[in-house]
C-alpha cells in the first residue's frame, strides 16, 4: 500500500562495529523522506532521523542501552512537503529491517597493539583496550568491559627474517611470549569471540615491529 | 552440520608431490583456523601446520618447512596441503581439523582423514 | 617447543573401573590444553578443553584437571565404548604439540 508518490525502502542493513550502529537503506530519495522507527522484541517504538533526506540513520544511543537484547527497525516513507499524507490503508509505507543484536553481531574493530616490552628472551605485548559507546554509570566501556572473557586476542608473531607466523592466544589484553635472543619480531594481532559462528574476528591490527618506535628493549 | 572432508591421497613415489584438499561445509573457513594434523602407521599425532584463510598467515613442523605449503581458497571453502619431496617418513594419514581460536586452542572438528603413501 | 609427556603408554582396565591419565608440559601453557580419544581407522574426537572444560555431547564421566603443569583426564566409570586412545595437546602456543597417547584396553 502507500501513496502512488512515495515508494517502499528496501535493502535495510545493519553495519555496526564496535557497538557503533547505523542502519542503511536505499532508495536514495526522489520526492520522499523517511523517518526511522526502532524497538526491541518487547518494547515501544522509538523514532528517530525525522523527515530525513538520508538513507542511513546512526542507531547506536539506542542499542547501547543494552547490547545484549535484539531490535527491530523500521523505516516510513512519505512525501516531501506534505508528510501528514499516508498510504491507502491510513498509515505511511515502511519496511521492516531485519532482527539485530549487538552483542552477537556487532562486528569486531581493527585492534591495535598499543605496546611492546623485550626483557631478555621474553616479549610482553599489549593490546589497546579500545572504548566503545556503550556506556555504565556514565562512563564508557571498554571492548573488554563489554566481551569480557568471550574476547580472545590472537597474536601472530614472526621474526623479521623469517615467513612462518607463530601464534599465541589471551583472553586478557596481553601476551608474554618467547623469543630468540638478539632476533628482531613483527606483531599483529587479530581480535576474536570463539563463541560466535559469524562475524567471529576483526581484520589484523597493523604490524608493529621491533626495532620501530612502539616498542621497548631491556636486556638482562 | 560442520563437516570437514579430505581427498586427494594414495599411493606417491619418493622424491613426489601430492596435494590434498580440506573441504569444508556448515560453516565458513574465513572465519576459522584451519590445522593439517598427520598419523603415521601405529603412532601418534604430529602437528603438520595451519592457515588463517582471513589473512594468509601460516606456520608449519620444522620436519615440514620448506617441502610442504598450505594455501586456502575461500571462494571454495577449501584448504589445500601442497606436499613435495616427500619421504618415505612422510607415510600417514593426514586430517584437517578446525580450530576455534579459542585461548586453549583446541581442535573441535575434525576430517575423516585420507591415507599418503610415499613408497616406490 | 613445549613438550607434552603423557603416561602411561598403555593401560589395561575393566568396565566400571575409574581410570586416570596425565600429562606434563615441559613448560607453563596456562589452561591450554585439549583431550582427545581416539578409535581405530578414526579421526580424533575431542573431549575436554581448557584442562578443565567438558565438550558439548561428551559423557560427565569424562574429566579434566591441571595442577600447574600437570594436567590430568579422567574416566570415573570406564565404559565399553571408551576403549581407545587418548591424547593430550597444547596450544598455548605454535606449534600445537601432543601428548604420545595413553591406549586403554580391556583387561
Known amino acids: 500500500s502507500g501513496t502512488t508518490n512515495t515508494v517502499a525502502a528496501y535493502n535495510l542493513t545493519w553495519k555496526s562495529t564496535n557497538f557503533k550502529t547505523i542502519l542503511e537503506w536505499e532508495p536514495k530519495p526522489v520526492n520522499q523522506v523517511y523517518t526511522v522507527q526502532i524497538s526491541t522484541k518487547s518494547g515501544d517504538w522509538k523514532s528517530k532521523c525525522f523527515y530525513t533526506t538520508d538513507t542511513e540513520c546512526d542507531l547506536t544511543d539506542e542499542i547501547v542501552k543494552d547490547v545484549k537484547q535484539t531490535y527491530l527497525a523500521r523505516v516510513f516513507s512519505y512525501p516531501a512537503g506534505n508528510v501528514e499524507s499516508t498510504g491507502s490503508a491510513g498509515e505511511p509505507l515502511y519496511e521492516n529491517s531485519p532482527e539485530f543484536t549487538p552483542y552477537l553481531e556487532t562486528n569486531l574493530g581493527q585492534p591495535t597493539i598499543q605496546s611492546f616490552e623485550q626483557v631478555g628472551t621474553k616479549v610482553n605485548v599489549t593490546v589497546e583496550d579500545e572504548r566503545t559507546l556503550v556506556r555504565r554509570n556514565n562512563t564508557f566501556l571498554s571492548l573488554r568491559d563489554v566481551f569480557g572473557k568471550d574476547l580472545i586476542y590472537t597474536l601472530y608473531y614472526w621474526k623479521s627474517s623469517s615467513s612462518g607466523k607463530k601464534t599465541a592466544k589471551t583472553n586478557t589484553n596481553e601476551f608474554l611470549i618467547d623469543v630468540d635472543k638478539g632476533e628482531n619480531y613483527c606483531f599483529s594481532v587479530q581480535a576474536v569471540i570463539p563463541s560466535r559462528t559469524v562475524n567471529r574476528k576483526s581484520t589484523d591490527s597493523p604490524v608493529e615491529c621491533m626495532g620501530q618506535e612502539k616498542g621497548e628493549f631491556r636486556e638482562i | 552440520e560442520v563437516q570437514l572432508v579430505e581427498s586427494g591421497g594414495g599411493l606417491v613415489q619418493p622424491g613426489g608431490s601430492s596435494r590434498l584438499s580440506c573441504a569444508a561445509s556448515?560453516?565458513?573457513?574465513?572465519?576459522?583456523?584451519i590445522h593439517w594434523v598427520r598419523q603415521a602407521p601405529g603412532k601418534g599425532l604430529e602437528w603438520v601446520g595451519y592457515i588463517d584463510p582471513s589473512n594468509g598467515y601460516t606456520d608449519y613442523a620444522d620436519s615440514v618447512k620448506g617441502r610442504f605449503t598450505i594455501s586456502a581458497d575461500t571462494s571454495k571453502n577449501t584448504a589445500y596441503l601442497q606436499m613435495n619431496s616427500l619421504r618415505a617418513e612422510d607415510t600417514a594419514v593426514y586430517y584437517c581439523?578446525?580450530?576455534?581460536?579459542?585461548?586453549?586452542?583446541?581442535?573441535?572438528?575434525w576430517g575423516q582423514g585420507t591415507l599418503v603413501t610415499v613408497s616406490s | 617447543d613445549i613438550q607434552m609427556t603423557q603416561s602411561p603408554s598403555s593401560l589395561s582396565a575393566s568396565v566400571g573401573d575409574r581410570v586416570t591419565i596425565t600429562c606434563r608440559a615441559s613448560q607453563d601453557v596456562n589452561t591450554a590444553v585439549a583431550w582427545y580419544q581416539q578409535k581405530p581407522g578414526k579421526a580424533p574426537k575431542l573431549l575436554i578443553y581448557s584442562a578443565s572444560f567438558l565438550y558439548s555431547g561428551v559423557p560427565s564421566r569424562f574429566s579434566g584437571s591441571r595442577s600447574g603443569t600437570d594436567f590430568t583426564l579422567t574416566i570415573s566409570s570406564l565404559q565399553p565404548e571408551d576403549f581407545a586412545t587418548y591424547y593430550c595437546?597444547?596450544?598455548?602456543?605454535?606449534?600445537?604439540?601432543f601428548g604420545q597417547g595413553t591406549k586403554v584396553e580391556i583387561k
Open positions: 556448515g560453516f565458513t573457513i574465513y572465519d576459522y583456523i
Open positions: 595437546q597444547q596450544h598455548y602456543t605454535t606449534p600445537p604439540t
Open positions: 581439523a578446525r580450530d576455534i581460536q579459542s585461548v586453549s586452542g583446541e581442535f573441535d572438528y
